[in-house]
């Protein structure tokens, strides 16, 4: 019994004066608490508590269930205890079959003994199955058997408390361990689509998938910069133990322009939080925006190829696309395809392939596209660069020499005179008159230039060269002159192509 200094309140004393008492089933339990300020006896076993206000606790015929801790308390709140074992060969264990453990924590298998003198107090697997190799436990006859550091792998483990009595193994009722997982990572969250584009009045529905080890994961849809509680629906599944999935679906049945914004799916557990966002854009009506991928004014050399390429945004999906030239629709030579295979893609590409263009094929090429809401178009002005071609070169009745050349860009005509048999015509001659003949027409075809010089300026035999040139190339025509007396005669004019 405890000893206390005089003057200080002392704990009650119990008779018999020992910490443990063993009685046989059917025998009497008689416990006396001596204290001037006696208050009560308390009996505890397996979370059950009984009280007795008499200073003597008497149980005439002890049963196994009378096994437990008897505590006497005085008015000062001081107490003293004795543990009583009621030995019953037919009931070696008192059990509370509830067995829950939290991962990485210890948990108590509540199977206290009624006889502390049995041996080999331990745990055994059900139906002779071995316990997991890493399962460690500490037996305590008064409390039960403590499993150390519970693992997830022990979930739904079936086990018995076991003792050896007279050389035989005796098992308790079975226990099924239920393990609550520890959250060791943030929830995994994903969203059905990262962005949504809708017209007013259409339904907006987006699903967030939350995955975790337990259904005790919190999740919610939030509107960024808003506290409004959003209406969401849940579906959930357990794909086996510790593999939980929840789908939280947010719906706005008739979206409005002011519903546009960022929506966040937020989830948290005791480890931490995670979130994912989706963007909603609501437009009052559909649209098409066209972006040329090359300059809308195109210069291309005669005989070469060119690709007219546009990208365009279309919402809703484009329904009709066409390329037109001179009021004629191309049936082939073009392709139209989405920029990406993404479900939310609204960007498309259209390409018109023009091959071996002729000088006559310059002009306006138009791309037209439409959807259920709008039409849109873009025009490309295509200029075909052609080497000058000398159309006519004549000596006119008024004594003028005239050269007419066509090409694109507009050719420049220069004149040269070569005396005698010189091959190189270097002395330039200024023209009397230069005219662009078809400047009033459409600017896509070849441009025609006419240039004239006065042949009376030439006093000697020789050759006159008319040279037409532009960025693409040059072409020359020659007039040969011979003087017979006072007469000047034009001998066959001819052209020479000079690359």
């Amino acid at each position: 019994q405890p000893s206390v200094s005089p003057g200080e309140p002392s704990p009650p004393s119990i008779h018999p004066g020992k910490s443990d008492l063993i009685v046989r089933v059917g025998d009497e339990i008689r416990l006396l608490c001596t204290d001037p300020g006696f208050v009560k006896w308390t009996f505890e076993i397996l979370d059950e508590t009984n009280e007795n206000k008499q200073n003597e606790w008497i149980t005439e015929k002890a049963e196994a269930t009378n096994t437990g801790k008897y505590t006497c308390t005085n008015k000062h709140g001081l107490s003293n205890s004795i543990y009583v074992f009621v030995r019953d060969p037919a009931k070696l264990f008192l059990v509370d079959r509830s067995l829950y453990g939290k991962e990485d924590n210890d948990t108590l298998v509540r199977c206290p003994l009624t006889d502390p003198e049995v041996t080999n107090y331990s745990l055994k697997g059900c139906q002779g199955k071995p316990l997991p190799k890493d399962l460690r436990f500490i037996p305590d006859p008064k409390a039960g058997i403590m499993i150390k550091s519970v693992k997830r792998a022990y979930h739904r483990l079936c086990l018995h408390c076991s003792v050896d009595q007279e050389g035989k193994s005796v098992l308790s009722e079975k226990f099924i361990l239920k393990v609550r997982p520890a959250f060791k990572a943030v929830p995994v969250v994903s969203v059905s689509k990262a962005s949504y584009l809708l017209r007013e009045g259409e339904e907006f529905t987006v699903t967030c998938t939350i995955k975790d080890v337990s259904s005790s994961v919190y999740s919610t849809w939030k509107r960024e910069n808003s506290q409004t509680k959003l209406q969401e629906k849940y579906n959930s599944w357990h794909h086996g133990d510790f593999n939980y999935e929840r789908q939280a679906t947010l719906t706005i049945s008739s979206a409005r322009v002011n519903d546009s914004g960022v929506f966040m799916c937020y989830a948290n557990n005791t480890f931490g939080s995670a979130n994912v966002t989706t963007t909603l854009e609501v437009v009052d009506k559909g649209f098409i925006n066209i972006f040329p991928m090359i300059n809308t004014t195109v210069f291309v050399n005669d005989g070469e190829n060119v690709d007219l390429i546009v990208e365009y945004e279309a919402f809703p999906k484009p329904e009709h696309q066409q390329w037109i030239y001179m009021n004629r629709t191309f049936t082939d030579k073009w392709e139209d395809y989405p920029k990406s295979e993404n479900e939310s893609n609204i960007r498309y590409v259209s390409e018109l392939h023009l091959t071996r263009l002729k000088g006559t094929e310059g002009g306006t090429y138009t791309f037209l596209v439409s959807n259920s809401d709008v039409n849109a178009a873009i025009a490309f002005n295509v200029y075909v660069n052609t080497k000058p071609e000398i159309l006519t070169y004549d000596r006119l009745v008024n004594g003028m020499l005239q050269c007419v050349a066509a090409g694109f860009p507009e050719p420049t005509i220069d004149w040269y005179f070569c005396p005698g048999t010189e091959q190189r015509c270097s002395a330039s001659v200024l023209p009397v008159d230069v005219q662009t003949l078809n400047s009033s027409g459409p600017p896509f075809g070849k441009l025609v230039v006419q240039s004239s010089i006065d042949s009376s300026a030439f006093k000697h035999n020789g050759t006159v060269e008319c040279k037409a040139y532009n960025d693409v190339g040059k072409t020359s025509a020659y007039f040969n002159f011979a003087f017979k007396g006072n007469n000047k005669e034009q001998i066959h004019p001819h052209t020479l192509f000079t690359p």
């Epitope: 397996l46 979370d47 059950e48 509370d96 509830s98 829950y100 453990g101 939290k102 948990t107 739904r156 239920k178 609550r180 337990s214 259904s215 005790s216 994961v217 919190y218 849940y234 579906n235 959930s236 599944w237 357990h238 086996g240 133990d241 939980y244 557990n269 005791t270």
Partner: antibody, heavy 119, light 106 residues
Framework: QVQLVQSGAEVKKPGSSVKVSCKAS????????ISWVRQAPGQGLEWMGG????????NYAQKFQGRVTITADESTSTAYMELSSLRSEDTAVYYC????????????WGRGTLVTVSS | DIQMTQSPSSLSASVGDRVTITCRAS??????LNWYQQKPGKAPKLLIY???SLQSGVPSRFSGSGSGTDFTLTISSLQPEDFATYYC????????FGGGTKVEIK
């Protein structure tokens, strides 16, 4: 042995709320799943929702989402179920039971609380 | 939600009879199926968990089988105290119970 002890019968007016309690005597209440299951007169069983006190997050059946609130007080080992906007169809026996979350079976039941909704 | 369909909704049997109750899930629930017995004015009582495991203290005449979508509760030899209503319950998704099977005395 652990027991679940529920609060007494209630009579409520339509539109009002009711809060039923469920006290667990002993055991590791903290990591139990405590669920609420109701049974209308002559009808079957209907799960309303549940909570694991240690985690503090309640799960609700879709049908009751927004109308039921399940909480737990670890210090008193007591779980609560509050049902709002009561209507006559909510007249039922409301049971608390251990289990019902994370694939737990209902291995322990309270005796039930009769809630009568009548004007 | 996963629908649980129990059949029959009621049956009449005599003491000593072998009784079989079936429960069908609208989609696979693996083995997450439990069976309960309920007597009038009382709370339900767990009989079988995880489709086939017998709860402690429940007589061995009760047995459960099945997995996926089809499950069976069998009472091998009906006793007077077994006249009650039996419910199945799935635990894969939001918990749902079958409509119940009332076992009455013939």
């Amino acid at each position: 042995q652990v027991q679940l002890v529920q609060s007494g019968a209630e009579v409520k007016k339509p539109g009002s709320s009711v809060k039923v309690s469920c006290k667990a005597s002993g055991g590791t209440f903290r990591i139990y799943a405590i669920s609420w299951v109701r049974q209308a007169p002559g009808q079957g069983l209907e799960w309303m929702g549940g909570i694991i006190p240690d985690f503090g997050v309640a799960n609700y059946a879709q049908k009751f989402q927004g109308r039921v609130t399940i909480t737990a007080d670890e210090s008193t080992s007591t779980a609560y179920m509050e049902l709002s906007s009561l209507r006559s169809e909510d007249t039922a026996v409301y049971y608390c039971a251990r289990g019902g979350l994370d694939t737990d079976e209902f291995d322990l039941w309270g005796r039930g609380t009769l809630v009568t909704v009548s004007s | 939600d996963i629908q649980m369909t129990q059949s029959p909704s009621s049956l009449s049997a005599s003491v000593g009879d072998r009784v079989t109750i079936t429960c069908r899930a609208s989609q696979s629930i693996n083995s997450y199926l439990n069976w309960y017995q309920q007597k009038p004015g009382k709370a339900p009582k767990l009989l079988i968990y995880a489709a086939s495991s017998l709860q402690s203290g429940v007589p061995s005449r009760f047995s459960g089988s099945g997995s996926g979508t089809d499950f069976t509760l069998t009472i091998s030899s009906l006793q007077p105290e077994d006249f009650a209503t039996y419910y199945c319950q799935q635990g894969v998704s939001d918990i749902t119970f079958g409509g119940g099977t009332k076992v009455e005395i013939k």
